[in-house]
């Protein structure tokens, strides 16, 4: 595999990771796929320091992160353990609210205008943040 030693153009380096901040919106799944096509993932917040860094760059705007419970338990897209990891939910969130009238509950997490997290309908077109780690060898699959 090959190692990424510096961030791509228009990405921001911070603590050995690269971040890209959208300025337009997509549904959570489309944002997730966007990041994957850039060999990245929706941002995974692992510390208060990283939370403050992301919050500074996105401002007071609803923004998707790489956290969802579409298959039951809450999961980070990169496999980071949710139960033991950093959390920054708004009070009384997540609540899997069904009262929005859009069908189903709320399965995708986003930063709210004050930076704290909320669960919301995954189809909402929010901004998003991609993250990729530096110095991590990218495993190229064998050719068929």
């Amino acid at each position: 595999g090959s190692e990424r030693t510096c961030c791509p153009v228009n990405w921001v380096e911070h603590e050995r990771s690269c971040y890209w901040f959208s300025r337009s919106g997509k549904a959570w799944a489309d944002a997730d796929n966007y990041c994957r096509l850039e060999d990245a993932h929706l941002v995974v917040v692992t510390s208060w320091e990283e939370q403050k860094f992301v919050q500074h760059h996105i401002g007071p705007v609803n923004t998707w992160m790489g956290l969802h419970d579409q298959n039951g338990p809450w999961k980070w897209v990169d496999g980071t353990d949710y139960e033991t990891g950093f959390k920054n939910w708004r009070p009384e969130q997540p609540d899997d609210w069904y009262g929005h009238g859009l069908g189903g509950g709320e399965d995708c997490a986003h930063f709210t205008d004050d930076g704290r997290w909320n669960d919301d309908v995954c189809q909402r077109p929010y901004r998003w943040v991609c993250e990729t780690e530096l110095d991590k060898a990218s495993q190229e699959p064998p050719l068929l």
Epitope: G1, S2, P8, S22, R23, S24, G25, K26, D30, A31, N33, Y34, R36, L37, E38, D39, P125, S138, Q139, E140, P141
Partner: antibody, heavy 121, light 108 residues
Framework: EVQLLESGGGLVQPGGSLRLSCAAS????????MSWVRQAPGKGLEWVSV????????FYADSVKGRFTISRDNSKNTLYLLMNSLRAEDTAVYYC??????????????WGQGTLVTVSS | DIQMTQSPSSLSASVGDRITITCRAS??????LNWYQQKPGKAPKVLIY???SLQSGVPSRFSGSGSGTDFTLTISSLQPEDFATYYC??????????FGQGTKVEIK
């Protein structure tokens, strides 16, 4: 100068297989996702498949899922499309295309000349 | 999948004419809309990305506008080399990108 050169097309019977190749030059191949787009004779464009720069992430149109496999060899600057269980409706010119991401939108900024795949008995 | 519908499917025009091609999405796609030109026997070529941004090297007579569900491609003064088929493509739904059916611009 960016160049994409497809090869491997031809006549194949229904149920048969074919592997297309796309040789790339003029850019850092491993830094870009690559895609296949096809065009049936006299018809419009249809996205088929895409693969991320590292080759780790792949996606397919529903019409080819489970039958086609996209892959790449970054050491050879080459993109592939393995097509199995071919059907008459897969008959088309197949283009390889370089995908670029700008300001949150994806589009195809360079295309190959295409290779014709004909599925017929 | 998001459906893209172009109109008209074909049009006849003369050199120097101003023409407009429209593209409608089956749901809101914000500004995730690209335009391509294709000449017979050739590969498509990108003209406009993100609804209104002109791709490098494309003449300024081409312009794009719109957001949400309705978009237009305008050629301000049609040139002989502009007779071709034009396709819109949405890139909101990633990566199930879909194209319009095409608009053929012919010489009157």
């Amino acid at each position: 100068e960016v160049q994409l050169l497809e090869s491997g097309g031809g006549l194949v019977q229904p149920g048969g297989s074919l592997r297309l190749s796309c040789a790339a030059s003029g850019f850092t191949f491993s830094s870009y996702a690559m895609s296949w787009v096809r065009q049936a004779p006299g018809k419009g464009l249809e996205w088929v498949s895409v693969i991320s720069g590292s080759g780790v992430n792949t996606f397919y149109a529903d019409s080819v899922k489970g039958r086609f496999t996209i892959s790449r060899d970054n050491s050879k600057n080459t993109l592939y499309l393995l097509m199995n269980s071919l059907r008459a409706e897969d008959t088309a010119v197949y283009y390889c295309a370089k995908k670029i991401a700008v300001a949150g939108t994806h589009y195809f900024d360079y295309w190959g000349q295409g290779t014709l795949v004909t599925v017929s008995s | 999948d998001i459906q893209m519908t172009q109109s008209p499917s074909s049009l006849s025009a003369s050199v120097g004419d101003r023409i407009t091609i429209t593209c409608r999405a089956s749901q809101s796609i914000s500004s995730y809309l690209n335009w391509y030109q294709q000449k017979p026997g050739k590969a498509p070529k990108v003209l406009i990305y993100a609804a209104s941004s002109l791709q490098s090297g494309v003449p300024s007579r081409f312009s794009g506008s719109g957001s949400g569900t309705d978009f237009t491609l305008t050629i301000s003064s049609l040139q002989p080399e502009d007779f071709a088929t034009y396709y819109c493509q949405q890139s909101y739904s990633t990566p199930t990108w879909t194209f319009g059916q095409g608009t053929k611009v012919e010489i009157k």
